[in-house]
């Protein structure tokens, strides 16, 4: 899933206010839902029929530092008999996330949102039958 | 997947610097790789053998105001034939990710990074078996 | 969005070995499904092989089967094809392509390709 692009209106004041210094902002340093549990199944990235590996990748310069890709690990999917079957396709299923990223300049330190392109995972889909011309 | 707690050092500056003062830091207003592309498989949510639809949440205080969550169709997964086989199973695949929250005091504006858990698609997933004791 | 250039191809006696490279540029390259197609001159474009994100799966067409290895490095963003024992009959441009889904990509109908790289077999 793609984000739009921010609205031009977004960083700014209520119009009965006075205008904001241009570029920054004041950013609070606490995270809401900082503490919010996740539960996903277990290992569907091994038991799935369209079966993923995660690598990762690490930016001390960036919130979160650590951010996962999946990689589909087969062309095809995996049929009831643990084989794979090209007549069917594993596809990637991919987000657009953000994440903080952290720019020094001297002691002057600020930050900028990043979009990051995420694969999260694969799906096993029926493909599109293409002709043979 | 989960993104960890952001680090006490994540804002602050190097130690042979000033301390900032407690609780805000600057927040630069453009977004880095914001005209990115992203490609998606045509259709998968559709052509999944686990397939979902999407709900739209809004909110126009976070950036991105628009949030999509998927939900699976399916308890089961499709079979070849077009018909639902409960013997294997949709499941949700989760994301934590970041938005950006806009608070308003008068004619204060600040803002906070507020973790979001996306359900990004579904994949299709042999059943773990319980045995009967 | 997704770059790719091949590079690698030249003049090579019959019997010969050659190693294309294909370099991607993009921020995501391990998602992709990636392959190699040839051209041979007034001929059709001609689907070689293909391989997973991960590397784990290969599927090659069966006429090059045994002589040409794909092979992939994500650390790298590169994709490779090695040609062993080559004949005059591999003459051809060689594309390197890309897309998230390898029923796409079998059928000649990728999103991303490269521009071509020249193998020529002869003495």
């Known amino acids: 899933r793609k984000i739009p692009k921010v609205g031009h209106t977004f960083f700014q004041k209520p119009e009965s206010c006075p205008p904001v210094p241009e570029g920054s902002m004041k950013l609070d340093t606490g995270i809401i839902n900082e503490n919010q549990r996740v539960s996903m199944s277990r290992n569907i990235e091994s038991r799935s029929t369209s079966p993923w590996n995660y690598t990762v990748t690490w930016d001390p310069n960036r919130y979160p530092s650590e951010v996962v890709q999946a990689q589909c690990k087969h062309l095809g999917c995996i049929n009831a008999q643990g084989k794979e079957d090209i007549s069917m396709n594993s596809v990637p299923i991919q987000q657009e996330t953000l994440v903080l990223r952290r720019k020094h300049q001297g002691c002057s330190v600020s930050f900028q949102l990043e979009k990051v392109l995420v694969t999260v995972g694969c799906t096993c889909v029926t493909p599109v039958v293409h002709h043979v011309q | 997947r989960k993104i960890p707690k952001v680090g006490h050092t994540f804002f602050q500056k190097p130690e042979s610097c000033p301390p900032v003062p407690e609780g805000s830091m600057k927040l630069d207003t453009g977004i880095i790789n914001e005209n990115q592309r992203v490609s998606m498989s045509r259709n998968i949510e559709s052509r999944s053998t686990s397939p979902w639809n999407y709900t739209v949440t809004w909110d126009p205080n976070r950036y991105p105001s628009e949030v999509v969550q998927a939900q699976c169709k399916h308890l089961g997964c499709i079979n070849a034939q077009g018909k639902e086989d409960i013997s294997m199973n949709s499941v949700p695949i989760q994301q934590e990710t970041l938005v950006l929250r806009r608070k308003h005091q008068g004619c204060s504006v600040s803002f906070q990074l507020e973790k979001v858990l996306v359900t990004v698609g579904c994949t299709c997933v042999t059943p773990v078996v319980h045995h009967v004791q | 969005d997704v770059q790719l250039v091949e590079s690698g191809g030249g003049l090579v006696q019959p019997g010969g070995s050659l190693r294309l490279s294909c370099a991607a540029s993009?921020?995501?390259?391990?998602?992709?499904?990636v392959g190699w197609f040839r051209q041979a001159p007034g001929k059709e474009r001609e689907f070689i092989g293909a391989?997973?994100?991960?590397?784990?799966?290969?599927y090659y067409a069966v006429s090059e089967k045994g002589r040409f290895t794909i092979s992939r490095d994500n650390s790298k963003n590169t994709l490779y094809l090695q040609m062993n024992s080559l004949r005059p009959e591999d003459t051809a441009v060689y594309y390197c392509?890309?897309?998230?889904?390898?029923?796409?990509?079998?059928?000649?109908?990728?999103?991303?390709w490269g521009q071509g790289t020249l193998v020529t077999v002869s003495s």
């Open positions: 993009g921020r995501t390259f391990s998602s992709y499904v």
């Open positions: 392509t890309a897309d998230q889904e390898f029923g796409y990509l079998r059928f000649g109908r990728s999103e991303y």
């Open positions: 391989i997973s994100g991960s590397g784990e799966s290969i």
